[in-house]
């Protein structure tokens, strides 16, 4: 993350990733002051003229916005005064991926951080067993992905094993035309054993288990973002 | 090595017009908002106009407002400034320089400009 | 408009300690910049963000600004940093100083 301490007061940012079409949080902290009024908050985008967001004298202040951030922006008025300059971004777009500066003045001077932010879809894939299939079948689906991610598939029996051959990805494109549902179907699936499929690019990883018994299916999803650092 | 070279600077009349160009190398071109900055004969440095990275947001110093005009061909990393209704003050050494946040980190060698019958 | 004052000329032996200043109305709140500008040449950024220095800029270039007044000191100066010198802020354009003329005796 990125800390300046040189123009006398710390800003702290986190790198994060942006889920297109949802809110994103742009995440940035500071020495609080004792007076919100004495408070200036402003978010600037390299490459863009206008300004990101503004908030000075306990309120937001617009007048320099960028058209490409008009109505999209927000920040978290009642924590300001604790320190939280973060950045709230609803629908985000693709194009709001970039480098982003946390800009801070208060009474006991000013300071400003960076933070890269990178932007694309990722979901939580769901495995089901495909009763319709010719043989034992496992189908991994996940609605939302960008950039085209990579599918591999894990099993806990057979650690380390190749399932390329034996199985078979498809990518189709949403209907906003950017972002892709991911299908990826594993054949000649034994019972008793737990498979993953685990899908990535360069922002998020996510992986769906399953496990298949006699008696019953267990599932489960997990999704984290690269390249942030909580 | 991150380069900008200007081009397309002359002799012209009152009245005329004239397109600079400049031309970037060694960085990701798109990603940088640019500026044109000129400086008349014995001044100092004036600012001119300014373009967003994505070329969809332009400012312009009210001496110039109307009369020209910044652009960018993202495809060919080249910068422009069209010049019309040229006047004898706007002859100047004209600069593009890479805008870096509040400032600019990267200029050009320039071009000269000269407007004269 | 937003406007910036600087000194026509400051004069400084060599290995002393040059100050440039640059006065606007509560400049201390905005990001101030500093260009060095030899004869002939396009100006080159020395000080950006106040006070940072950009890498192969000697460490003998500093900044500092708060309240209305933003300065620019150059410590045991050499002949080779005689120069023209620009501040500037961002205001919906980049504004310029009137430049300083930086004469090494």
């Known amino acids: 993350f990125g800390i300046s301490g040189r123009h006398s007061i710390t800003v702290t940012t986190v790198a994060s990733a942006g889920n297109i079409g949802e809110d994103g949080i742009l995440s940035c902290t500071f020495e609080p002051d004792i007076k919100l009024s004495d408070i200036v908050i402003q978010w600037l985008k390299e490459g863009v003229l206008g300004l990101v967001h503004e908030f000075k004298e306990g309120k937001d202040e617009l007048s320099e916005q960028d058209e490409m951030f008009r109505g999209r922006t927000a920040v978290f008025a009642d924590q300001v005064i604790v320190g939280n300059a973060s950045l709230r971004l609803k629908n985000v777009q693709l194009t709001d991926a970039g480098t982003y500066k946390c800009y801070i003045i208060t009474s006991k001077g000013k300071g400003n951080a960076n933070l890269e932010y990178k932007t694309g879809a990722f979901s939580m894939p769901e495995v089901n067993v495909d009763y319709n299939a010719s043989s034992e079948t496992l189908r991994c689906e996940a609605p939302r992905w960008f950039p085209q991610p990579t599918v591999v598939w894990a099993s806990q029996v057979d650690q380390g094993a190749n399932f390329s051959e034996v199985s078979n990805t498809s990518f189709e494109l949403n209907s906003e035309n950017v972002t892709m549902k991911v299908v990826s179907v594993l054949y000649n699936v034994t019972i008793n054993n737990t498979y993953s499929c685990m899908i990535e690019n360069d922002i998020a990883k996510a992986t769906g288990d399953i496990k298949v018994t006699e008696s019953e299916i267990k599932r489960r999803s997990h999704l984290q973002l690269l390249n942030s650092k909580a | 090595e991150v380069q900008l070279v200007e081009s397309g600077g002359g002799v012209v009349q009152p009245g005329r017009s004239l397109r600079l160009s400049c031309a970037a190398s060694?960085?990701?071109?798109?990603?940088?908002?640019m500026n044109w900055v000129r400086q008349a004969p014995g001044k100092g440095l004036e600012w001119v106009s300014a373009?967003?990275?994505?070329?969809?947001?332009?400012y312009y110093a009210d001496s110039v407002k109307g009369r020209f005009t910044i652009s960018r061909d993202n495809s060919k990393n080249t910068l422009y400034l069209q010049m019309n209704s040229l006047r004898a003050e706007d002859t100047a050494v004209y600069y593009c320089?890479?805008?870096?946040?509040?400032?600019?980190?990267?200029w050009g060698q320039g071009t000269t400009v000269t407007v004269s019958s | 408009s937003y406007e910036l004052t600087q000194p026509p000329s400051v004069s400084v032996a060599p290995g002393k300690t040059a100050r440039i200043t640059c006065g606007g109305n509560?400049?201390?709140?905005?990001?101030v910049h500093w260009y060095q500008q030899k004869p002939g040449q396009a100006p080159v950024l020395v000080v950006y963000?106040?006070?940072d220095r950009p890498s192969g800029i000697p460490e003998r270039f500093s900044g500092s600004n708060s309240g209305n007044t933003a300065t620019l000191t150059i410590s045991r100066v050499e002949a080779g940093d005689e120069a023209d010198y620009y501040c500037?802020?961002?205001?919906?354009?980049?504004?310029f100083g009137t430049g300083t003329k930086l004469t090494v005796l």
């Open positions: 500037q802020v961002w205001d919906r354009g980049m504004i």
């Open positions: 373009i967003s990275a994505s070329g969809a947001s332009r």
């Open positions: 320089a890479r805008k870096r946040w509040y400032g600019m980190d990267v």
């Open positions: 963000d106040d006070s």
């Open positions: 060694g960085f990701t071109f798109s990603d940088r908002a």
């Open positions: 509560n400049i201390g709140s905005k990001s």
